[in-house]
């Protein structure tokens, strides 16, 4: 079906070849050795798209066999495929590196949706498109999965970013980002700029397209625009963080903080959509809902089940707001807030039927594991995850998708009073039920 | 109900070869990992060798490596232990075990039920 | 490998006592422990798994406890059905290894 409007787009930055990288000039001091600048060798070493991940390139073992790493802020360990798969191209073969360490340990890990359990070990890792290092990191070598792998997706294990405590087993099995830190003069510090290409990319479009940039060590400012404003991670497990006030174009949710935060807050590159606790999702669908009324979607859209299409260059992106989340600042009372456009938050899908419309999926969803910050806001955003401060900062994204209208905007201050009451304290329960969380 | 029935044991001479079978009725067979386990006469339980649902991962305990092979057949819902190069060591009750589940490391998938064992006796 | 310690060797005790089985582990198992009961001349059965979770049909009076090296098996008011070999087994390291068994036997 189309739907509405013609607007034709792409034609401001949005239509941009990925590639694109606006210059920026600045006069900020560095605020430590080799945390700012120029990171030329990693920027545009990520692939991917939102609904698939974006991944990395990395080598493991010796010789190096290079593998497709998917990018996750979500969970912390480092696993690779190692057997035989339908939808692996290549796999880790322990067998044939003289450096793999056995750790005659098994690992489970399960997904909200999927699963993979494998066997530890070490090895020698690196990142051709990152430091110049190699490190002796655990891996999880996947034996057998369900429902985790993905076909056509092009990676083969995924990066668990995230802090030892959420780490499988248990954790005393240190994250790779851990060793990388522990073993190098890598600062602790990472930073993301995931690129949404606005439209949907066939198989050989991501192979040959950029997906964006992992900085490791550093900021590159060629990445963004603007200034970097930074959240506090409240608790080391997670990235977590706290949102302290949702406005859907600019109208206050006007509910009790804590809700947004409950069960806690993320941001993770792992999961696609902007996730949101049930009873945020219904007031931020409702909202969203009546802004959009000038035309009705039906209610398999507001699911994420459904596709809605218009014919090619006509989205109505006027008819959809911007969704602001605030976060909390560094300074007490002081909050910002983070605004994303629809085109984060519609994705672009292909609808094999009517491939000359432009379809896409809602990709805000409800969850019961609490707020993730998923690639659909993190594609507005240059994200940097500083570890050595406890903090995380968002940047406008050089390459993010928008129009001649709207953009996407990091913005502050604005005061704030009790933020701290905005965050949810989890009841202690057994480590085991805990649930890496997925969309 | 779920049914486990081992056979293939007998009396071999050291060196000499065997090959366990298990059937197994009752459940979907190729959902669940499945393990072998031995009681030597008097004596306690040692675990000999695990396999996944699929049959993609095995394991086995150091006493056996490289002599004993686990696999399965999911068509023919049986388990197999092919062993070779037998010591008398290796005289023992073999039990076969159904796991908890296809993973072997998840929460809660522990070996239960086992079938009633079949007797290997290595001996000249 | 990880060595699993059963004590004691022999437990004699009469119906309706209370019977507490050690279990202690040479390097952390996690909660990666299960008891297992077995008769003479019968396969072993589950009991407890995850160090602390009754199997499907186990009766309340069984029931484990802790995590990392030292676990306990008890069984709070012994039924004549219960005098039988117990085993505890580990699945958290390469290769799994049972103890060495508890006798529960009747005075």
């Known amino acids: 079906t189309q739907h509405g409007i013609r607007l034709p787009l792409r034609s401001g930055l949005g239509g941009a070849p990925l590639g694109l990288r606006l210059p920026r000039e600045t006069d900020e001091e560095p605020e430590e050795p080799g945390r700012r600048g120029s990171f030329v060798e990693m920027v545009d070493n990520l692939r991917g798209k939102s609904g698939q991940g974006y991944y990395v390139e990395m080598t493991v073992g010796s010789p190096p066999q290079t593998l497709n790493i998917l990018v996750d802020t979500g969970s912390s360990n480092f696993a690779v495929g190692a057997a035989p798969h339908p939808f692996l191209h290549r796999y880790y073969q322990r067998q044939l590196s003289s450096t793999y360490r056995d750790l005659r340990k098994g690992v489970y890990v399960p997904y909200t949706q999927g699963k993979w359990e494998g066997e530890l070990g070490t090895d020698l890792v690196s990142i051709p498109h990152g430091p110049n290092v190699t490190v002796r990191a655990n891996i999880a070598a996947i034996t057998e999965s369900d429902k985790f792998f993905i076909n056509g997706s092009n990676w083969e294990g995924i990066l668990g970013l995230a802090y030892a405590e959420i780490a499988r087993p248990d954790d005393s099995l240190e994250p790779f980002f851990d060793s990388l830190v522990k073993q190098t003069h890598v600062p602790n510090l990472f930073s993301l700029q995931l690129c949404g290409a606005g439209f949907p990319l066939n198989q050989s479009e991501v192979l040959a397209s950029v997906g964006g940039s992992m900085i490791i060590g550093g900021i590159d400012h060629s990445l963004y625009t603007g200034s970097l404003w930074y959240t506090p991670i409240r608790r080391e497990w997670y990235y977590e963080v706290i949102i302290v006030r949702v406005e859907i174009n600019g109208q206050d949710l006007k509910m009790d903080c804590k809700e947004y935060n409950y069960d806690k807050s993320i941001v993770d590159s792992g999961t696609t959509n902007l996730r949101l606790p049930k009873k945020v999702f219904e007031a931020a669908v409702k909202s969203i809902k009546a802004a959009s009324s000038t035309e009705k979607f039906p209610d398999g859209f507001w699911l994420g089940e459904q596709l809605v299409c218009w014919q090619a260059g006509t989205t109505p992106w006027n008819i959809f707001p911007v969704i602001s989340l605030y976060l909390m600042g560094e300074v007490t009372n002081q909050s910002f807030r983070i605004t994303i456009l629809p085109q984060q938050y519609l994705r672009p899908v292909e609808d094999v039927a009517t491939s000359q419309d432009d379809c896409y999926k809602f990709a805000i969803s409800q969850s019961s594991t609490g707020t993730v910050m998923g690639a659909v806001i993190m594609e507005g955003f240059y994200v940097v995850f500083d570890r050595a401060r406890k903090r995380i900062g968002f940047a406008v994204s050089a390459c993010h998708v928008h129009d001649e209208f709207r953009t996407a905007a990091v913005e502050g201050p604005f005061v704030t009073l009790d933020m701290e009451d905005c965050g949810y304290n989890i009841p202690q329960t057994d480590e085991s039920t805990l649930m890496t969380g997925r969309a | 109900e779920v049914q486990l029935l081992e056979s293939g044991g007998g009396l071999v001479q050291p060196g000499g070869s065997l090959r366990l079978s298990c059937a197994a009725s009752?459940?979907?067979?190729?959902?669940?990992?499945m393990s072998w386990v031995r009681q030597a006469p008097g004596k306690g339980l040692e675990w000999v060798s695990a396999i996944s649902g699929s049959g993609g991962s095995t394991y086995y305990a150091d006493s056996v490596k490289g002599r004993f092979t686990i696999s399965r057949d999911n068509s023919k819902n049986t388990l197999y232990l092919q062993m070779n190069s037998l010591r008398a060591e290796d005289t023992a009750v073999y039990y076969c075990?159904?796991?908890?589940?296809?993973?072997?490391?998840?929460?809660?998938?522990?070996?239960?039920?086992w079938g009633q064992g079949t007797l290997v006796t290595v001996s000249s | 490998e990880i060595v699993l310690t059963q004590s004691p060797a022999t437990l004699s005790l009469s119906p309706g006592e209370r019977a507490t089985l050690s279990c202690r582990a040479s390097?952390?198992?996690?909660?990666?422990l299960a008891w297992y009961q077995q008769k003479p001349g019968q396969a072993p059965r589950l009991l407890i798994y995850?160090?602390?979770n009754r199997a499907t049909g186990i009766p309340a009076r069984f029931s484990g406890s802790g995590s990392g090296t030292d676990f306990t098996l008890t069984i709070s008011s012994l039924e004549p059905e219960d005098f039988a070999v117990y085993y505890c087994v580990q699945r958290s390291n390469f290769p799994w290894t049972f103890g060495g068994g508890t006798k529960v036997e009747i005075k």
């Open positions: 075990a159904k796991g908890g589940s296809q993973w072997l490391y998840a929460p809660g998938s522990w070996f239960d039920p």
């Open positions: 009752g459940f979907t067979f190729s959902s669940y990992a």
């Open positions: 390097q952390s198992v996690s909660s990666y």
């Open positions: 995850d160090a602390s």
